[in-house]
Amino acid sequence: SGTTNTVAAYNLTWKSTNFKTILEWEPKPVNQVYTVQISTKSGDWKSKCFYTTDTECDLTDEIVKDVKQTYLARVFSYPAGNVESTGSAGEPLYENSPEFTPYLETNLGQPTIQSFEQVGTKVNVTVEDERTLVRRNNTFLSLRDVFGKDLIYTLYYWKSSSSGKKTAKTNTNEFLIDVDKGENYCFSVQAVIPSRTVNRKSTDSPVECMGQEKGEFREI
């Protein structure tokens, strides 16, 4: 049951990258407004985005409290200008979201190669440890802080003159690879959480090549 002239939200979808988490839904409101509630499976409902005409609600502040919990959200529909009005059953119309477990489901953001340094026939490639909105002791945690060894990086590297991509993997943020002397190489990295079955990989980082500013070359 619901309120006269209101329609229930539908297509409730979680959009989450590196724990920045937004709930989206349809339809665009016509003469109605929405309020979102979120809760863990065992917790109380908390209201967010009160009486909004938006069709999205940023729930990051709630989910970062415990990224390993499973969350459920619901979107209530109210007639515009009459938000106290309820349906015949005494409650507004609402729709439930799918369950969402941030640790297992947040998309991995595009990584960035912070630097690379060549010493002789070795190159050290460092991946930027991106900050998330997850907090511990009033400090924002990095992606590595949150995922620990569950997060790995795959490095793709290739001679500028060739197309075949070699790979290396690390469960830190650094790679040490062997290269041929006198050859220029290009690099791209991908974040991966191998223990997942879905949303396992990030998009690739921008390609960085030797001979550009980010790198440093030392002949030993």
Epitope: Y156, G164, K165, K169, V192, P194, K201
Partner: antibody, heavy 120, light 107 residues
């Protein structure tokens, strides 16, 4: 259930071409990398190459470079091995295998293999 | 490319025997070594990954160890179904390479 099924093998003359398919089910290939490994009759395992379907990156073994090309169609959840300029020494059972891309990643699932015979 | 030198190429053993197969990497591969079992006409099956970790569903009589660039697969008590060919593989760097294989036959 995770499954890899190779097809497309057969008898081909030296210098000929063949395209092998590796159809995946139970997982999405773009979340993994797919490798091709071959085994000549009575011999050991030889790595042929890989593709990361999420970005199209590939690498081929020196023994097949310039003759074989690995590709993937994520909409069909299938990887391919295009083999040109085939030689007698390419005669083998060809396997595709899934790489979970962990630091310790071995090939956790393999197809049943498809036999390619290069002979006149 | 990294070479994986596997020995012996074949061995004969009886049910209940302890069997050891070794692989030596031509350079450091950290712990990025796997062991596979292959039976005639079948695809290889993963036994051990990361040098010493037992893959899901593999009997505990199989174990792996590492000492520097030397890697060992041990079958503590050979069973009838263990007669097969075993391969080591390094996946530390591209291209991944396999050992030549060890055929375990019935004595």
């Amino acid at each position: 259930e995770v499954q890899l099924v190779e097809s497309g093998g057969g008898l081909v003359q030296p210098g000929g071409s063949l395209r092998l398919s590796c159809a995946a089910s139970g997982f999405t290939i773009s979340d993994y990398t797919i490798h091709w490994v071959r085994q000549a009759p009575g011999k050991g395992l030889e790595w042929v190459g890989y593709i990361d379907p999420s970005n199209g990156y590939t690498y081929h073994a020196d023994s097949v470079k310039g003759r074989f090309t690995i590709s993937a169609d994520t909409s069909k959840n299938t990887a391919y091995l295009q083999m040109n300029s085939l030689r007698a020494e390419d005669t083998a059972v060809y396997y595709c295998a899934r790489d979970p891309q962990s630091v310790s990643s071995p090939f956790d699932y393999w197809g049943q293999g498809t036999l390619v015979t290069v002979s006149s | 490319d990294i070479q994986m030198t596997q020995s012996p190429s074949s061995l004969s053993a009886s049910v209940g025997d302890r069997v050891t197969i070794t692989c030596r990497a031509s350079q450091d591969v950290n712990t990025a070594v796997a062991w596979y079992q292959q039976k005639p006409g079948k695809a290889p099956k993963l036994l051990i990954y990361s040098a010493s970790f037992l893959y899901s569903g593999v009997p505990s009589r199989f174990s792996g160890s590492r000492s520097g660039t030397d890697f060992t697969l041990t079958i503590s008590s050979l069973q009838p179904e263990d007669f097969a060919t075993y391969y080591c593989q390094q996946h530390y760097t591209t291209p991944p390479t396999f050992g030549q294989g060890t055929k375990v036959e019935i004595k």
